[in-house]
Interface confidence: low
């Protein structure tokens, strides 16, 4: 198989080195020459020629392949020209010859992928590998080949990417800290509890890849899908030269699904305790897990220990399945929070779902705000509300919704960021229900919407009322 990697080498006598401390040369003969017909001789400048012991392999398709593995490491020297020639002993003729530098004929053995697992974000894949010859790993570059594992489509899309060793890991900016300036105050950012943009292809060229030594992280994959992956390496072309080695044996990995699919929502009320909730699946049990990471750059240990998220008592102990599962844990404000939900179906199959990582200050849920109103003229309401949290008044945005009596559809209004009230024009002599909710969406704090306030019933007057 590796021989085919040298196909672009036009020399009849092909040579390669796995570790630059070894050398293998071979050539193919179509003719059925008797055993012992050929000798492979070699010599460094100003040295006597020596014979390299040959073995032959019958190649039914080609004839015979003659192979020489240099017997002694001492005979393999870098940066000196090595003369090689094949002599026909019986005909006393040179069959073929070449001059090479061992340092330019590298064909590294494939790395061994030792671990492949989901990364810290949905659609991320993290792999680590071992280099068969660690002493040359600094002089190699790596390429990763991967694609979706689809039994129905063995020729699914494949991505081949060079691993960028100069990058340590993806910049760990604050997860999802989208600038609040370029959006309406209450626009939904892509938060761990909301639908982000859907990935359309499991192997888009946009997927990012970074590496640190013997590990790398791929992103932009399809959460919940299975992937196969392979690695190969080649000399960097600066210190050492050669060709791409063969691909490692394929490794397959099942990526966790995106917890968005379960409607995962995590929040804190006190910046200490985090509560997570997700939709309970029919005929399935589920369990939440969490871990904290302080990673700014590549952590030494990329394989975290997940801790149990303490399950909350079911709110309805009746027979029907509760709508949500909830769990809670103590958190820290100096770490990124990672959430995993495992759903076990009746046959015992476990499906994992990964939440998008977040900081605790990105998941602050406000208490439900109180709404006060007075009618200043017919159908003209003045609204007021108390900030649920005075400490973050300037980062709090609100949504007001109202509906006419007997109507199903709600009209939603978004007052300006930090507003403490507003006015509302309604039809005179009509009945309405009004509700208010709040959430943090500033540079310091963000979080999910509070629950809607209890409906406030308003009956507008016929004429001006003070």
């Amino acid at each position: 198989q590796d021989v085919s990697l040298l196909a672009s080498d036009s020399e009849p006598l092909k040579c390669f080195s796995r570790t630059f401390e070894d050398l293998t040369c071979f050539w193919d003969e179509e003719e059925a020459a008797p055993s012992g017909t050929y000798q492979l001789l070699y010599a460094y400048p100003r040295e006597k020629p020596r014979a390299c012991p040959l073995s032959s392999q019958s190649m039914p398709h080609f004839g015979t392949r003659y192979v020489c593995q240099f017997p002694d490491q001492e005979e393999v020297r870098l940066f000196f020209p090595l003369h090689l020639w094949v002599k026909n002993v019986f005909l006393n003729q040179t069959r073929t010859q070449r001059v090479l530098f061992v340092d330019s004929v590298g064909l590294p053995a494939p790395p061994s992928i030792i671990k492949a697992m989901g990364g810290s974000q949905p659609g991320e894949l993290q792999i680590s590998w071992e280099e068969p010859a660690p002493e040359i790993s600094d002089f190699l570059r790596y390429e990763l080949r991967y694609g979706p594992r689809d039994p129905k489509n063995s020729t699914g899309p494949t991505v081949i990417q060079l691993i960028a060793t100069e990058t340590c890991c993806p910049a760990l900016q604050r997860p999802h800290s989208a600038s609040a300036l370029d959006q309406s105050p209450c626009a939904q950012p892509t938060m761990p509890w909301q639908d982000g943009p859907k990935q359309t292809s499991p192997s888009r060229e946009a997927s990012a890849l970074t590496a640190e030594g013997g590990s790398c992280l791929i992103s932009g994959l399809q959460p919940g899908n299975s992937y196969w992956l392979q690695l190969r390496s080649e000399p960097d072309g600066i210190s050492l030269g050669g060709s791409w080695g063969s691909w490692s044996l394929p490794v397959t990995v099942d990526l966790p699904g995106d917890a968005v699919a379960l409607g995962l929502q995590c929040f804190t009320l006190d910046l200490k305790n985090v509560t997570c909730q997700w939709q309970q699946q029919d005929h399935a049990s589920s369990q939440g897990f969490f871990y904290h990471s302080r990673a700014r750059c590549c952590p030494r240990d990329r394989y975290p220990i997940w801790e149990n998220c303490e399950e909350e008592e079911k709110t309805n102990p009746g027979l029907q399945t509760p709508q949500f599962s909830r769990c809670h844990f103590k958190s820290r404000n100096d770490s990124i929070i990672h959430i995993l939900v495992e759903v076990t179906t009746a046959p015992g199959t476990v499906h994992s779902y990964l939440g998008s990582p977040f900081w605790i200050h990105q998941a602050v849920r406000l208490p439900t705000p109180n709404l006060h109103w007075r009618e200043i003229s017919s159908g003209h309401l003045e609204l007021e509300w108390q900030h649920p949290s005075s400490w973050a008044a300037q980062e709090t945005c609100y949504q007001l919704r109202y509906t006419g009596e007997g109507h199903q559809d709600w009209k939603v209004l978004e007052p300006p960021l930090g507003a403490r009230g507003g006015t509302l024009e309604l039809r005179p002599r009509s009945r309405y229900r009004l509700q208010l909710r709040a959430r943090l969406n500033g540079p310091t704090y963000q979080g999910p919407w509070s629950s809607w306030s209890d409906p406030t019933r308003v009956e507008t007057a016929t004429e001006t009322a003070w």
Partner: antibody
């Protein structure tokens, strides 16, 4: 035109050694190519037994390796098969075939039936 | 060993029919696949090599397709002399292995 002809005893007793020869005409077996033995139990599919190359290198099916020997008699231009310790499961039609340039069996003998029975 | 699985194991067809036989390898064999035809009491005859290449002298109604693990032999218009058993064989990895055969019978 290359022709292959298998020959050997049609009946072999259990535990004995089955010996077959394949006589090749129209081509020297030491010039080139690889010479194969394949068998087909009654009503069953084909099973590759092994080959010998023009240069005498052999390769055998691991399932039979401990019992099989393929050799050539260059003077008679024959390839021989020896299968030791036979049982009724070795009852089959035995074919020799040439593995040609394309790695496929391009020339076959007509086959010889061997029954293992006491 | 690489397992070769043919389907169907038998089929009934009429003269002029288009017949398709599939062969699946238990691992990737690239295009190292041959198809043989065998008639009762006769030795197999090579039809297709390298998955898609027609052996010299074989009628053009026979064609092969596929690569990797899934392969197909197609007879575009079945002739009376085509009623036989067909075998696929991989020659990617020793030991060479055959499919269990597909018997094409007259309907």
């Amino acid at each position: 035109q290359v022709q292959l002809q298998e020959s050997g005893p049609g009946l072999v007793k259990p535990s004995q050694t089955l010996s077959l020869t394949c006589t090749v005409s129209g081509y020297s077996i030491t010039s080139d190519y690889t010479w194969n033995w394949i068998r087909q139990p009654p009503g069953n599919g084909l099973e590759w037994i092994g080959y010998i190359t023009y240069s005498g290198s052999t390769s055998y099916n691991p399932s039979l390796k401990s019992r099989v020997l393929i050799s050539v008699d260059t003077s008679k231009n024959q390839v021989s098969l020896k299968l030791s310790s036979v049982t009724a499961a070795d009852t089959a039609v035995y074919y020799c075939a040439r593995l040609g340039r394309r790695y496929t069996m391009d020339y076959w003998g007509q086959g010889t039936t061997v029954t293992v029975s006491s | 060993d690489i397992q070769m699985t043919q389907s169907p194991s038998s089929l009934s067809a009429s003269v002029g029919d288009r017949v398709t036989i599939t062969c699946m390898a238990s691992e990737d064999i690239y295009i190292r696949l041959a198809w043989y035809q065998q008639k009762p009491g006769k030795a197999p005859k090579l039809l297709i090599y390298a998955a898609t290449s027609l052996e010299t002298g074989v009628p053009s109604r026979f064609s092969g397709s596929g690569s990797g693990t899934d392969f197909t032999l197609t007879i575009s218009s079945l002739q009376p002399e085509d009623f036989a058993t067909y075998y696929c064989q991989q020659y990617w990895s020793s030991p060479w292995t055959f499919g269990q055969g597909t018997k094409v019978e007259i309907k």
